[in-house]
């Protein structure tokens, strides 16, 4: 499945308080499910991967082809 | 709690430049998409640009593309709008919203008058 | 470009009343449609996202629906603050925003 990376932003859209860590914001998350088709305007976000969109938090996703990391799948993996 | 401030707004004459900026607080701006946003005098509201979080993907609108330039400085918690060769149809209530997709929270707005 | 159009323009209503308004898109934009409300002189404040999803802090009332190209924003008792104007706005294609319903007193 390569590797999952989540853009840094979160909407906080389904929090009481925005910096309340509701939806996990760490680049490597692996978690499963809650996600749809990218809008098409997020059609080239991702560089070395596919784009995925995080329903909870209304925010484009990368998961990255292998030997790519970022939050764009942007750089090489020097460790892959 | 968040806020974000818009400051950089006036009067300028067809053809010239302003640069607005956007300052936040109150959540961590390094990880959030911002754009900017603006609304002509009793008219509807139209996007204008966005920015990723590390300021490497930007979308702009038509109307404004090849004349405004946004970009941001996440070690200074701002955002910024350059504005060139500027119009009329460009005077508006800029207002700066966090997110790049859904706007969950807006500053108050700075006013751009384009007029001779 | 998507067009969005929002019907209707404007209307009148009384405290307490269902009021709906429509949205529909120029091409399908699957849920990628948000809802939000200005009050003069006001920045907008967003109430609904994914067409039907109820921002955190907005009164029940308002709901919204619809997928593809029709969409619809209810607010099913109004309330003497939610006299303002409502913007749909897609986000599947670069963002845009309908021209906006203003709601006032009857």
């Known amino acids: 499945d390569g590797n999952s990376t989540r853009s840094p932003e979160t909407n906080g859209l389904l929090c009481g308080d925005p910096e309340e860590n509701c939806a996990a914001t760490t680049t490597q998350s692996k978690r499963k499910g809650h996600f749809s088709r990218c809008p098409k305007q997020y059609k080239h976000y991702c560089i070395k991967g596919r784009c995925r969109f995080v329903v909870a938090e209304q925010t484009p996703s990368c998961v990255c082809d292998e030997g790519y990391i970022g939050a764009r799948c942007e750089r090489v993996d020097l460790f892959y | 709690q968040v806020q974000l401030l818009e400051s950089g707004g006036g009067l300028v004459q067809p053809g010239g430049s302003l640069r607005l900026s956007c300052a936040a607080s109150g959540f961590t701006f390094s990880r959030y998409w911002i754009s900017w946003v603006r609304q002509a005098p009793g008219k509807g509201l139209e996007w204008v640009s966005y920015?990723?979080?590390?300021?490497?993907?930007?979308h702009y609108a038509d109307s404004v593309k090849g004349r405004f330039t946004i970009s941001r400085d996440n070690s200074k918690n701002t955002l910024y709008l350059q504005m060139n060769s500027l119009r009329a149809e460009d005077t508006a209530v800029y207002y700066c919203?966090?997110?790049?997709?859904?706007?969950?929270?807006w500053g108050q707005g700075t006013l751009v008058t384009v007029s001779s | 470009d998507i067009q969005m159009t929002q019907s209707p323009s404007s209307l009148s209503a009384s405290v307490g009343d269902r009021v709906t308004i429509t949205c529909r898109a120029s091409q399908g934009i699957i849920s990628y449609l948000g809802w939000y409300q200005q009050k003069p002189g006001k920045a907008p404040k967003l109430l609904i996202y994914?067409?039907?999803s109820l921002q955190s802090g907005v009164p029940s009332r308002f709901s919204g629906s619809g997928s593809g190209t029709d969409f619809t924003l209810t607010i099913s008792s109004l309330q003497p603050e939610d006299f303002a104007t409502y913007y749909c706005q897609q986000y599947d294609a670069l963002n845009t925003f309908g021209q906006g319903t203003k709601v006032e007193i009857k």
């Open positions: 920015i990723d979080s590390t300021g490497t993907f930007i």
């Open positions: 994914a067409a039907s």
């Open positions: 919203a966090r997110g790049g997709s859904l706007f969950d929270y």
